[in-house]
C-alpha cells in the first residue's frame, strides 16, 4: 500500500489497513478488528488465560509476553533440548533437573542432599541436626548434655561428632557379655587388687574401691618424704628406726654405751622382729637406770635434760616399732624395775586398760586411732621407777602463770616423788589435746598424813630439758598408797607429795 | 672479743691428708664444746665433728667417721682436724665453731674458714 | 639422720615486708633447732636458737617458732642489709644437721 494510503494516527502496537483504517497486530486486541477511530488502542492479548487454548504441558507454565506468551519448565525442571522457552505441549520436553548432582556441595557439612521432583532437600545425618539460623547446616547433636541420658549409670557418656558412646567408668569392666561402648553398655567394678590389674608398688598394699583402688603402706612402713599415703603412686619405705643419740652437749661414758646399743638394734632391725627390738632396747634401758654411772655426776639439769630425751625418744622409738607388731597383747618385765605393756588391736570401740605392777591406764580405743589411718591402734605404757634417780630436784611449775612453786614459806623446797614415772603413748602422736580423759591409777610409798598429793605429768620445757606441771591432769582420789589422777593429754606421769600441808595450800595449785 | 681462726687449708689429691688448726681467743676455751662445720661449694652447711670442752668426747657424722680425728690442745686454745684419706666429696669451706652453754647448744661464733680442695 | 628440709630455696621480697622462711624435720626434735644467717662472704651467725630465743644483739623483727617438727623464722620489716641465706639446724641428735638454706633477694 501507498504510504499516502495509510493512515498516520494508528495506535501503539496495529497497523493502517488504509487512509482512514487501522488494525492491530498480532497478539494484540481493539474493540473491533478493523478501527477507524483515532482514539481505540490495542491492548496485548494474555494468551495464557480463557478464553485462549494454549496448553503448555506438564511441569510448566505459560508466560505471557508483549503480543505474544512463552512456554516456560516450572523451577527445578529444563527442556532436554536446554532451551529456555518453546510454544506449545508438543515441544514439552520439560524434565526434573538433579540439583544434588549438579551442585555436590549444596547441602553443607554432615547433610545430605535429596533430589526431589522440581527442588531438592537438604537431611542431617545421624547424630547431627540443623542450625536455627541456617536450615543447610548441620551441626553435632550432644547426645550426652542434650537431657536424653542416654547411657547406663555404670558407663559414662562420650560424645563424638554424630554419635556418642557409653563406656565403662575408670576402674570398672563391662559385665559379662556386654559390649563397651555401645548405648546398651553395662559395666560392673573391677577389683584391680584380686585380678591383679592394679599398679601398687611392692611397698604397699591394694585396696579396691567402688570404681578404683588405693595403696596403702604395708604395716610398719610409712610413704617416702614428699608422697602421700592411699594414692595410687604410693611408694613407701621400711619404718625407720627413728634417730636417737646422746643429747648434743650431754658428755656420758655410759649414756654413749646405751645409745651405741641402741643404734646396733637399730642397725638390726630390719632383719629382727619388732618385738625382740622392743624387748632389747628395754633390757638396756633397765640396766642404763639401774647404773646410771657418770651420769649421776652430770649437773642436776642435765640428768634432768637426760631424762627427757630418754623418755621423748623411748615414746617414738615404741610408737615406730609398735607399727610393725600384729594385733594382740605385749607384757614385759625387768629386773630393775622396768615395765612394759602394749596392745595392738583393729579399730573397736570400747575402754582399753593396761594393767603393771604399780599403774593402771584406762582410756577409750578412739583415742589411739590417727585419723586418716585404718591400719591398727596401739596404745603402750612404759614403768620406769628407775628413772626417778634421774629427776631427782625438780621444780613444780603451776597452772596459772607457768610459775615455779615457791612461796616465803616453802622458799627452795621441793616436791616428793612418790610413784614411779609412767609413759604412755599411743598410735596417734597428736595427744597434747584428748578428746576424753585418760584415767591412771597409781600405787605408791605411803603418803604424810596431811599432805597434799598432786597428779602430774613431765613437760618438756623450751630449753629441751623439763620440770614437773599439773595443766589438764587432776587427782581424782588418793588413799594412803594409791591415788588416782585423770589427764586430758599424754606424756609421762608420776604422783607427788607437794612440800607442804593441806592446811597451808598455796593458791596456784588449788 | 672472741676470736677464732682456722688455717692449714690447701689443694690435696685424693687419698691424702690435711690437718687444720683453729686458734680460739678471748674466752674460756676450756669450758666450751666446739665443732667443724663445712661449706660446700653448691653452699650447702655439713657439720662434720664436735669435740666436748675437755676433749675426751669427739663426735662424728658417718660420712667422715675413721677418716677424720677432732683433737684439741686446752694449753694451747687450739683445735685440730685431722683429714686422711680425703675425697673429693670433702672439698669445702671447713669452719670452727664454739657451742653455747647446754642446753642452749647454738653455735654462736664461727672463725673465717679455711679452705680444702680435693682434687686430682 | 634427721633430714631437715627448707623448700623455699629461694625467697625474694621487699624492704619493709614481712616473710617467712620454713624448716621442717624428718622427726620429732621438740624444741632443739637454731637458725642461722649468712650475709655474702661471711661466716654463718647465729640468729635465733631453741627454735624461739633471739640470740644477743639480734633485731627483734627477727622471731623464731614452731616445735615439734616445723619451724619458722619471721623476718618483719625486712631491711636492705637482711640479704643473706639462712639456714636451720637440729641438736636433738647426732649427727647434727643443716637445712639446705634459703637465699633472700631484696628486690
Known amino acids: 500500500q501507498d504510504s499516502r494510503d495509510c493512515a498516520r494516527w494508528c495506535p501503539e502496537n496495529s497497523s493502517c489497513v488504509n487512509a482512514t483504517a487501522c488494525r492491530c497486530n498480532p497478539g494484540f486486541s481493539s474493540s473491533s478488528e478493523i478501527f477507524t477511530s483515532p482514539t481505540e488502542i490495542c491492548d496485548d492479548i494474555n494468551e495464557c488465560v480463557p478464553p485462549s487454548k494454549v496448553s503448555c504441558g506438564k511441569s510448566s507454565d505459560c508466560r505471557n509476553t508483549e503480543g505474544s506468551y512463552d512456554c516456560v519448565c516450572n523451577p527445578g525442571y529444563e527442556l532436554v533440548s536446554g532451551a529456555k522457552t518453546f510454544k506449545n505441549e508438543s515441544e514439552n520436553t520439560c524434565q526434573d533437573v538433579d540439583e544434588c548432582q549438579q551442585n555436590p556441595r549444596l547441602c553443607k557439612s554432615y547433610g545430605t542432599c535429596v533430589n526431589t521432583l522440581g527442588s531438592f532437600t537438604c537431611q542431617c545425618l545421624p547424630g547431627f541436626k540443623f542450625k536455627p539460623e541456617d536450615p543447610k547446616l548441620c551441626t553435632d547433636v550432644n547426645e550426652c548434655t542434650s537431657g536424653q541420658n542416654p547411657c547406663h549409670s555404670s558407663t559414662h557418656c562420650l560424645n563424638n561428632v554424630g554419635s556418642y558412646q557409653c563406656r565403662c567408668r575408670p576402674g570398672w569392666q563391662p559385665i559379662p557379655g556386654s559390649p563397651n561402648g555401645p548405648n546398651n553398655t553395662v559395666c560392673e567394678d573391677v577389683d584391680e587388687c584380686s585380678s591383679g590389674l592394679h599398679q601398687c608398688d611392692s611397698s604397699t598394699i591394694c585396696f579396691n574401691t567402688v570404681g578404683l583402688y588405693t595403696c596403702r603402706c604395708r604395716p610398719g612402713w610409712e610413704p617416702k618424704h614428699g608422697i602421700p599415703n592411699n594414692q595410687k603412686d604410693t611408694v613407701c619405705k621400711d619404718m625407720h628406726f627413728p634417730t636417737w643419740t646422746p643429747p648434743p652437749g650431754v658428755h656420758s661414758q655410759t649414756l654413749s654405751q646405751f645409745f651405741n646399743k641402741v643404734q646396733d638394734l637399730g642397725r638390726d632391725f630390719k632383719t629382727r622382729s619388732a618385738k625382740v627390738t622392743i624387748q632389747s632396747i628395754l633390757k638396756e634401758l633397765d640396766e642404763l637406770l639401774e647404773a646410771p654411772g657418770d651420769l649421776e655426776t652430770l649437773p642436776r639439769f642435765q640428768q634432768h635434760c637426760v631424762a627427757t630425751h630418754l623418755l621423748d625418744g623411748l615414746e617414738d622409738v615404741f610408737r615406730g616399732l609398735s607399727k610393725n607388731l600384729s594385733i594382740g597383747l605385749l607384757n614385759f618385765s625387768y629386773p630393775a624395775g622396768t615395765e612394759f605393756s602394749l596392745e595392738v588391736q583393729k579399730q573397736v570401740d570400747r575402754n582399753v586398760t593396761l594393767r603393771q605392777n604399780q599403774a593402771t591406764m584406762q582410756l577409750h580405743w578412739n583415742l589411739a586411732q590417727k585419723s586418716g589411718d585404718p591400719g591398727p591402734s596401739v596404745v603402750g605404757l612404759v614403768s620406769v621407777p628407775g628413772m626417778g634417780k634421774l629427776l631427782a630436784e625438780v621444780p613444780l611449775v603451776s597452772e596459772p602463770e607457768n610459775q615455779v612453786v615457791r612461796n616465803e614459806t616453802h622458799q627452795g623446797l621441793l616436791p616428793i616423788l612418790l610413784s614411779d614415772i609412767i609413759s604412755a603413748f599411743l598410735s596417734n602422736n597428736d595427744t597434747q589435746n584428748l578428746s576424753s580423759p585418760v584415767t591412771f591409777t597409781f600405787s605408791h610409798r605411803s603418803v604424810i598424813p596431811r599432805q597434799k598429793v598432786l597428779c602430774v605429768f613431765w613437760e618438756h620445757g623450751q630449753n629441751g630439758c623439763g620440770h614437773w606441771a599439773t595443766t589438764g591432769c587432776s587427782t581424782m582420789g588418793t588413799r594412803d598408797t594409791s591415788t588416782i589422777c585423770r589427764c586430758t593429754h599424754l606424756s609421762s606421769f608420776a604422783v607427788l607429795m607437794a612440800p607442804y600441808d593441806v592446811q597451808e595450800e598455796d593458791p596456784v595449785l588449788t | 672479743e672472741v676470736k677464732l681462726v682456722e688455717s692449714g687449708g690447701g689443694l690435696v689429691k685424693p687419698g691424702g691428708s690435711l690437718k687444720l688448726s683453729c686458734a680460739a681467743s678471748g674466752f674460756a676455751f676450756s669450758s666450751y664444746d666446739m665443732s667443724w662445720v663445712r661449706q660446700t661449694p653448691e653452699k650447702r652447711l655439713e657439720w662434720v665433728a664436735t669435740i666436748s670442752s675437755g676433749g675426751n668426747y669427739t663426735y662424728y657424722p658417718d660420712s667422715v667417721k675413721g677418716r677424720f680425728t677432732f683433737s684439741r690442745d686446752n694449753a694451747r686454745n687450739t683445735l685440730y682436724l685431722q683429714m686422711s684419706s680425703l675425697r673429693s666429696e670433702d672439698t669445702a669451706l671447713y669452719y670452727c665453731?664454739?657451742?653455747?652453754?647446754?642446753?642452749?647448744?647454738?653455735?654462736?661464733?664461727w672463725g673465717q674458714g679455711t679452705s680444702v680442695t680435693v682434687s686430682s | 639422720d634427721i633430714v631437715m628440709t627448707q623448700s623455699q630455696k629461694f625467697m625474694s621480697t621487699s624492704v619493709g615486708d614481712r616473710i617467712i622462711i620454713t624448716c621442717k624435720a624428718s622427726?620429732?626434735?621438740?624444741?632443739?633447732v637454731d637458725w642461722y644467717q649468712q650475709k655474702p662472704g661471711q661466716s654463718p651467725k647465729v640468729l635465733i636458737s631453741l627454735a624461739s630465743n633471739r640470740h644477743t644483739g639480734v633485731p627483734d623483727r627477727f622471731t623464731g617458732s614452731g616445735s615439734g617438727t616445723d619451724f619458722t623464722l619471721t623476718i618483719s620489716n625486712v631491711q636492705s642489709e637482711d640479704l643473706a641465706d639462712y639456714f636451720c639446724l637440729q641438736h636433738r641428735n647426732y649427727p647434727l644437721t643443716f637445712g639446705g638454706g634459703t637465699k633472700l633477694e631484696i628486690k
Open positions: 665453731a664454739r657451742h653455747y652453754d647446754y642446753p642452749d647448744y647454738a653455735m654462736d661464733y
Open positions: 622427726q620429732n626434735v621438740r624444741t632443739t
